[in-house]
């Protein structure tokens, strides 16, 4: 058993049929010695008396808010949550496996630049009695500070018969050094509590590996005289790190016909313009990627050819 | 050329070669990012590689003030990785095919380090840890980890040379 926060405790249980459970001793936070009784949740049934209460925690029915009273007055509370371990593996019932980039990916994180700011998100089908708390650091043995905000519900989607909820959190490294080569990864820890179930999820990454620039901005076409060619130009996204002579991007320009089956013409360039042939009813799209490190491509910025 | 005394390197040549290094480092192991490198019985094996850190002067401001600190750091790293790529970790089993990009990568690391430090000049270099894996699979794991950190190292070096070529070239 360990303390998650003041008056909230997590009991770690090996979860299998007829498991013995854990013996837990609760102590009433009071100078009083006599006449103390204990109850669980809203029930008025007295579970025991005395300053301490010993219970055998085996299942969710044994978890909840234990309260000690004296003469009708509440003295203190202890909330017990359960953390299940099945076959040596901690349960992951609350969050959905996003399976990208690999199985057992519950948290996904992205950064728009090298400033040390990043966003993480996760999915669940649970809509109520759900709380999240997020902590982060750079490295684990001698951790350097990363400040995370509160997790918020950022999207709701219908997937078949189910509703899916996306939560996200923004974090910022306290003393970020955008130009340095990271040697210690960022660690993100999410505590999830659904009713009386506790779970924790972690992710470890370098900012460089989660970089995904915003799409190029101000995408424009300029027809070239007496030609089917056009000059496409664009600019670095505002959110990208500066100076651009140092934090350079590379670009992919694509000409795509109306039908998805039509052959795509692609050009790769380090410049912020390119000359391409504009077919009727086609569109031109440009996306960006860090020039020197193969992290994710941005989403496409697109304009129609006509 | 960057000489310890402090004259300027051939920024444009260094830029071209460092960009080529980036391409080679990724072609040497594009899969490396998708592999689960947390093998059992695997200690942290690449902690001793030289990293370009915050105080090394490789940021745009530091380069403007005095690029020598940064160039020396990059040179150290290039020599370090060049030695690693020439060691048993990469020459042992499972063997790399003759056309593997690792061979070109090895040569390009040497080429860039020579651009930065011509014959007869000496910057102190970092000791190579004696990493001699006893099992072939550990050698493979080390390769992937080394390539992974090399990808990060050459990305910073390439940024330095690109910025230098754009802003510090005579």
């Amino acid at each position: 058993i360990w303390e998650l926060k003041k008056d909230v405790y997590v009991v770690e249980l090996d979860w299998y049929p007829d498991a013995p459970g854990e013996m837990v001793v609760l102590t009433c936070d009071t100078p009083e010695e006599d006449g103390i009784t204990w109850t669980l949740d809203q029930s008025s049934e007295v579970l025991g008396s005395g300053k301490t209460l010993t219970i055998q925690v085996k299942e969710f029915g044994d978890a909840g808010q234990y309260t000690c009273h004296k003469g009708g007055e509440v003295l203190s509370h202890s909330l017990l949550l359960l953390h299940k371990k099945e076959d040596g593996i901690w349960s992951t019932d609350i969050l959905k496996d996003q399976k990208e980039p690999k199985n057992k990916t519950f948290l996904r994180c992205e950064a728009k630049n090298y400033s040390g700011r990043f966003t993480c998100w996760w999915l669940t089908t649970i809509s109520t009695d759900l709380t999240f708390s997020v902590k982060s650091s750079r490295g684990s043995s001698d951790p350097q500070g990363v400040t995370c905000g509160a997790a918020t519900l950022s999207a709701e989607r219908v997937r078949g018969d189910n509703k899916e909820y996306e939560y996200s959190v923004e974090c910022q490294e306290d003393s970020a050094c955008p130009a340095a080569e990271e040697s210690l990864p960022i660690e993100v820890m999410v505590d999830a509590v659904h009713k009386l179930k506790y779970e924790n999820y972690t992710s470890s990454f370098f900012i460089r590996d989660i970089i995904k620039p915003d799409p190029p901005k101000n995408l424009q076409l300029k027809p070239l005289k007496n030609s089917r060619q056009v000059e496409v130009s664009w600019e670095y996204p505002d959110t990208w790190s500066t100076p651009h002579s140092y934090f350079s991007l590379t670009f992919c320009v694509q000409v795509q016909g109306k039908s998805k089956r039509e052959k795509k013409d692609r050009v790769f360039t380090d410049k912020t313009s390119a000359t391409v042939i504009c077919r009727k009813n086609a569109s031109i799209s440009v996306r960006a990627q860090d020039r020197y490190y193969s992290s994710s491509w941005s989403e496409w910025a697109s304009v129609p050819c006509s | 050329r960057a000489v310890p005394g402090g004259s300027s390197p051939a920024w444009t040549q260094c830029q071209q070669l460092s960009q080529k290094l980036c391409t080679l480092a990724w072609s040497a192991h594009p899969l490396v990012g998708h592999m689960d490198l947390r093998e059992e019985g695997d200690e942290e094996t690449t902690n001793d590689v030289p990293h370009i850190q915050c105080g090394d002067g490789c940021d745009p401001q530091g380069l403007r003030d005095n690029s020598q600190f940064c160039l020396q750091r990059i040179h150290q790293g290039l020599i370090f990785y060049e030695k690693l790529l020439g060691s048993d970790i990469f020459t042992g089993e499972p063997s790399l095919l003759p056309d593997s990009p690792v061979g070109q990568l090895h040569a390009s690391l040497l080429g860039l380090s020579q651009l930065l430090q011509p014959e007869g000049h000496h910057w102190e270099t970092q000791q190579i840890p004696s990493l001699s894996p006893s099992q072939p699979w550990q050698r493979l794991l080390l390769r992937f980890k080394i390539l992974r950190s090399l990808q990060a190292f050459v990305a910073v070096a390439a940024r330095v040379f690109a910025h230098g070529a754009a802003t510090l070239s005579p």
């Epitope: - | 042992g92 063997s95 095919l97 072939p136 493979l140």
Partner: antibody
């Protein structure tokens, strides 16, 4: 075509040594390793060790506690396996096999004993 | 050393029927979670062994009735429709750790 031709059968006294040769042809000798595997009469296969002429690396089965020495002569494309301090339980057919152990992007850990010698019967008897 | 345990020791299957051979390692013989360092060899009487399955890949020239599966510590070689020429002893071999080790062999016969 690729061929591995081993030296002939040997009868040895306990305590003595035997040196089995394996002449390779039909491929670039230095580009592959040579593995030695033995098989006692009616028994399974046992890996003894292997040598890679290109890297100069040799891997041994510690079970043989320094009794086995595997070498290769690149000039004659011949591999050798010497086993010393022979005992009766060393009676077996000794095979050499060409070992391809490579790493590519598609196959990061490809290992194949793809061509084998005909085997050399070594009998240890007093 | 990694101990490779094959089961069954011998197997009698009717022509055209499926034959399944198991190989269990005392330690994981996959690398990076997915790359297999487990191989299958076939040995016919009086002949040296022949490689039939390399990691997760069927060797070229080997009939596709042979298939290999498994990861971690448990592996299986399946012959989907046994032919007379498949009568042999089959060995698994791990090359994750030196010394490389063979399983004890499974003798496949026709019922």
């Amino acid at each position: 075509q690729v061929q591995l031709v081993q030296s002939g059968a040997e009868v040895k006294k306990p305590g003595s040594s035997v040196k089995v040769s394996c002449k390779a042809s039909g491929y670039t000798f230095a580009s592959y390793g040579i593995t030695w595997v033995r098989q006692a009469p009616g028994q399974g296969l046992e890996w003894m060790g292997e040598n890679y002429p290109r890297s100069g690396n040799t891997y041994y089965n510690e079970k043989f506690k320094g009794r086995v020495t595997i070498t290769a002569d690149k000039s004659t494309s011949t591999a050798y396996m010497e086993l010393s301090s022979l005992r009766s339980e060393d009676t077996a057919v000794y095979y050499c096999a060409r070992a391809e152990f490579i790493s590519t992007v598609v196959a990061p850990y490809y290992y194949a004993l793809d061509y084998w010698g005909q085997g050399t019967l070594v009998t240890v008897s007093s | 050393d990694i101990v490779m345990t094959q089961s069954p020791d011998s197997l009698a299957v009717s022509l055209g029927e499926r034959a399944t051979i198991n190989c269990k390692a005392s330690k994981k013989v996959t690398i990076f979670g997915s790359t297999s360092a487990l191989h299958w060899y076939q040995q016919k009487p009086g002949q040296p062994p022949k490689l039939i399955y390399n990691g997760a890949k069927l060797e070229s020239g080997v009939p596709d009735r042979f298939s290999g599966s498994g990861s971690g510590t448990d592996f299986t070689l399946t012959i989907s429709s046994l032919q007379a020429e498949d009568v042999a002893v089959y060995y698994c071999l791990q090359n994750k750790e030196v010394p490389y080790t063979f399983g004890g062999g499974t003798k496949v016969e026709i019922k």
